[in-house]
Amino acid sequence: MKVLQEPTCVSDYMSISTCEWKMNGPTNCSTELRLLYQLVFLLSEAHTCIPENNGGAGCVCHLLMDDVVSADNYTLDLWAGQQLLWKGSFKPSEHVKPRAPGNLTVHTNVSDTLLLTWSNPYPPDNYLYNHLTYAVNIWSENDPADFRIYNVTYLEPSLRIAASTLKSGISYRARVRAWAQCYNTTWSEWSPSTKWHNSYREPFEQH
């Protein structure tokens, strides 16, 4: 039994880091493998993660962490029974994938303006809370070419757009994702999408 693709890990910078790897053949990850992880600190404990299958030869493990600070560094040991298959380390702050925003809502009752709001996925005491920026994706269910991205570079989790920038009388969907420049993170997953029917009063033409 050998590791074909070494574990790569990302952290949500709150409580979970996710590590993925591939074995050289079909593997029952949960029965055959264990990933041990330990904070590099005099008084830390080793923790065991039981991996799940992620495709035939792929494995994924969700490492639970109390909290994360930028200096944290973890040792990782991948075991198959008594055999050490791989040894490495992981610094969560250098491999951050933020949590996806939630509760995306489209408010259509503001006159001729669409207000999109969502929730910051972090609590106020988390470092990322004040460092997230967002991308909002809006697309038409009827027209695949009607697909747009709005970059929200301010901290407030909301976006206002004129309803008239979208076509009237058709359904749209929106979703949002987050990233943090301070840690050069990857983008989060997209939030669940939300749907609304776009309608607005066309302005009277002046002759």
Partner: antibody, heavy 121, light 110 residues
Framework: EVQLLESGGGLVQPGGSLRLSCAAS????????MSWVRQAPGKGLEWVSA????????YYADSVKGRFTISRDNSKNTLHLQMNSLRAEDTAVYYC??????????????WGQGTLVTVSS | QSVLTQPPSASGTPGQRVTISCSGS????????VSWYQQLPGTAPKLLIY???KRPSGVPDRFSGSKSGTSASLAISGLRSEDEADYYC???????????FGGGTKLTVL
């Protein structure tokens, strides 16, 4: 409310032994590293010993190494310090404290009221 | 001799602002966070400031902490008689693999 309550201090002769205990409540004891910090009369604070949340990792200051033994019973939410071959310079108030959890943000966030250990003939 | 250096004493009159310094090195304060502890006469130490400048709930905002390079300081504004106590700084030391304290500063409110 987090509470740490030390017991077991007293007067002991040089070369003697004493066992300190610290009863913890108000938090999940098994999630935290725990420490003993002492303060000699009129002096400053000294980190004496510590034990990781599960008991697998232990620290001793050079001044007590080989004489003191720290242990914990997570089922009873209790921390212990067995002190052997006591010397006059071990005379101090011994505090039980919660932490530290990691190096970069190391802190003792809760302290007990302390128990006085006097080593004298 | 303590690893972290504090002035042995400081004083001020009620309402005044006083500052207590804590000097270390790259292996402790330079690389790790600083905490401050208050020890009122005859009582156990209590956490006053952690992560250089954060206050635990219940600690008045008259107390503030800061860090620059290998030094840290504790500032107390609007000094009160009940602030008379010993104040200790503390930090992890990477070289010693140990938590180290300053020698303590006795604050007198005149």
């Amino acid at each position: 409310e987090v509470q740490l309550l030390e017991s077991g201090g007293g007067l002991v002769q040089p070369g003697g032994s004493l066992r300190l205990s610290c009863a913890a409540s108000g938090f999940t004891f098994s999630d935290y590293a725990m420490s003993w910090v002492r303060q000699a009369p009129g002096k400053g604070l000294e980190w004496v010993s510590a034990i990781s949340s599960g008991g697998s990792s232990i620290y001793y200051a050079d001044s007590v190494k080989g004489r003191f033994t720290i242990s914990r019973d997570n089922s009873k939410n209790t921390l212990h310090l067995q002190m052997n071959s006591l010397r006059a310079e071990d005379t101090a108030v011994y505090y039980c404290a919660r932490g530290p959890q990691r190096s970069a943000t190391a802190v003792f966030d809760y302290w007990g009221q302390g128990t006085l250990v006097t080593v004298s003939s | 001799q303590s690893v972290l250096t504090q002035p042995p004493s400081a004083s001020g009159t009620p309402g005044q602002r006083v500052t207590i310094s804590c000097s270390g090195s790259s292996s402790n304060i330079g690389n790790n966070n600083v905490s401050w502890y208050q020890q009122l006469p005859g009582t156990a130490p209590k956490l006053l400031i952690y992560a250089n400048s954060k206050r635990p709930s219940g600690v008045p905002d008259r107390f503030s902490g800061s860090k620059s390079g290998t030094s840290a300081s504790l500032a107390i504004s609007g000094l009160r008689s009940e602030d008379e106590a010993d104040y200790y700084c503390g930090s992890w030391d990477d070289s010693l693999s140990a938590y180290v304290f300053g020698g303590g500063t006795k604050l007198t409110v005149l």
